[in-house]
Interface confidence: low
């Protein structure tokens, strides 16, 4: 891979746990300013695999509140507005990074943690197992 | 709100930027060990709003590789396997936290950054604007 020269203005890395322990500025930079603000506000309701959003709160985590999608139906909504059980509503899941306070209750010490969240639902054709 | 007592074993917070700058252990704890590894591996293909996954790589970001979903069609796949343009395939987007090297190329100094990623696609009923 490409070796990027180290910036001479980098903070000191004398910490015995380096490079596992790093300094992180929590002043979040948001790269989403130019995105379309209408992007997905009501998809949860208009989808053929609609979902509800549930609040998951944990003060020992950063961010402390995450919203989890739960599919409303096992099947998908058809053109008549009825649930079609020949199709399946399934959650689209993604692994995200969060910060976990470690040791617990510490205001300035965290550990990176990967958690799996359901972001929304999609309608899929079921896998049918034919018995010989 | 509830005040959680500070753990006496917390690291020192004398840093002048505290509490904006915190210590983070990059030794990731993965809470997803019991999840089904097949959980959504083929939904991108079986969905009525199928998508392709594109690799987005940035060595100055942690994680450096993120996969972005792009819907294959404007419409959705109907029961006959054809694209139905009376429905819309739309990306389900989510904001995620990443770490951005700051100053650039520093191995041990990061800033939290929020980026918007498309995780998958869902099929929605279009919003029809009726003209009087």
């Amino acid at each position: 891979g490409i070796t990027i020269p180290r910036n001479p203005g980098c903070p000191n890395s004398e910490d015995k746990n380096f490079p596992r322990t790093v300094m992180v500025n929590l002043n979040i930079h948001n790269r989403n300013t130019n995105t379309n603000p209408k992007r997905s506000s009501d998809y949860y309701n208009r989808s053929t695999s609609p979902w509800n959003l549930h609040r998951n709160e944990d003060p020992e985590r950063y961010p402390s509140v995450i919203w989890e999608a739960k599919c409303r139906h096992l099947g998908c909504i058809n053109a008549d507005g009825n649930v079609d059980y020949h199709m399946n509503s399934v959650p689209i899941q993604q692994e995200i990074l969060v910060l976990r306070r470690e040791p617990p209750h510490c205001p300035n010490s965290f550990r990176l943690e990967k958690i799996l969240v359901s972001v929304g639902c999609t309608c899929v054709t079921p896998i049918v197992h034919h018995v010989a | 709100g509830i005040t959680i007592p500070r753990n006496p074993g917390c690291p020192n917070s004398e840093d002048k930027n505290f509490p904006r700058t915190v210590m983070v252990n990059l030794n990731i704890h993965n809470r997803n060990t019991n999840t089904n590894p097949k959980r959504s591996s083929d939904y991108y293909n079986r969905s009525t709003s199928p998508w392709n996954l594109h690799r987005n790589e940035d060595p100055e970001r942690y994680p450096s590789v993120i996969w972005e979903a792009k819907c294959r069609h404007l419409g959705c796949i109907n029961a006959d396997g054809n694209v139905d343009y009376h429905m819309n395939s739309v990306p389900i987007q989510q904001e995620i936290l990443v770490l951005r090297r700051e100053p650039p190329h520093c191995p041990n100094s990061f800033r939290l950054e929020k980026i918007l990623v498309s995780v998958g696609c869902t099929c929605v009923t279009p919003i029809v604007h009726h003209v009087a």
């Epitope: 992007r39 959003l53 402390s64 509140v65 919203w67 | 904001e95 929020k114």
Partner: nanobody
């Protein structure tokens, strides 16, 4: 950091009224559409009402149309929800939310205010 603080919830009898307020700080309030969102006990999240940046357009979920009115005061960075003819099914925690973002991170949401409609 973005902060949204809701107030005005409480216990009210069916047919009664409440006015919810949301004090916003940490962002340019007048640049964002704002929502009132609710979560009934054991239920999913429901968008209740939305108001555009300048207050010119307002949207409501069918179940509250004609009973609830969303408004804003950009000079005071405040969002309001006037709730009239309250019903038992309006019982929920009400949150104000910034923008039309897929909700994930806490800085777009307040802690909520509980509205209980009961006789």
């Amino acid at each position: 950091q973005v902060q949204l603080v809701e107030s005005g919830g409480g216990l009210v009898q069916p047919g009664g009224s409440l006015r919810l307020s949301c004090a916003a700080s940490g962002f340019t309030f007048s640049s964002y559409g704002m929502y009132w969102v609710r979560q009934a006990p054991g239920k999913g999240l429901e968008w209740v009402a939305k108001i555009e940046q300048d207050g010119s357009e307002k949207y409501y979920v069918d179940s509250v149309k004609g009973r609830f009115t969303i408004s804003r005061d950009n000079a005071k960075n405040s969002l309001f929800l006037q709730m009239n003819s309250l019903r038992a099914e309006d019982t929920a925690v009400y949150y104000c939310a910034k923008g039309e973002i897929l909700p994930l991170y806490f800085d777009y949401w307040g802690q909520g205010t509980l509205v209980t409609v009961s006789s």
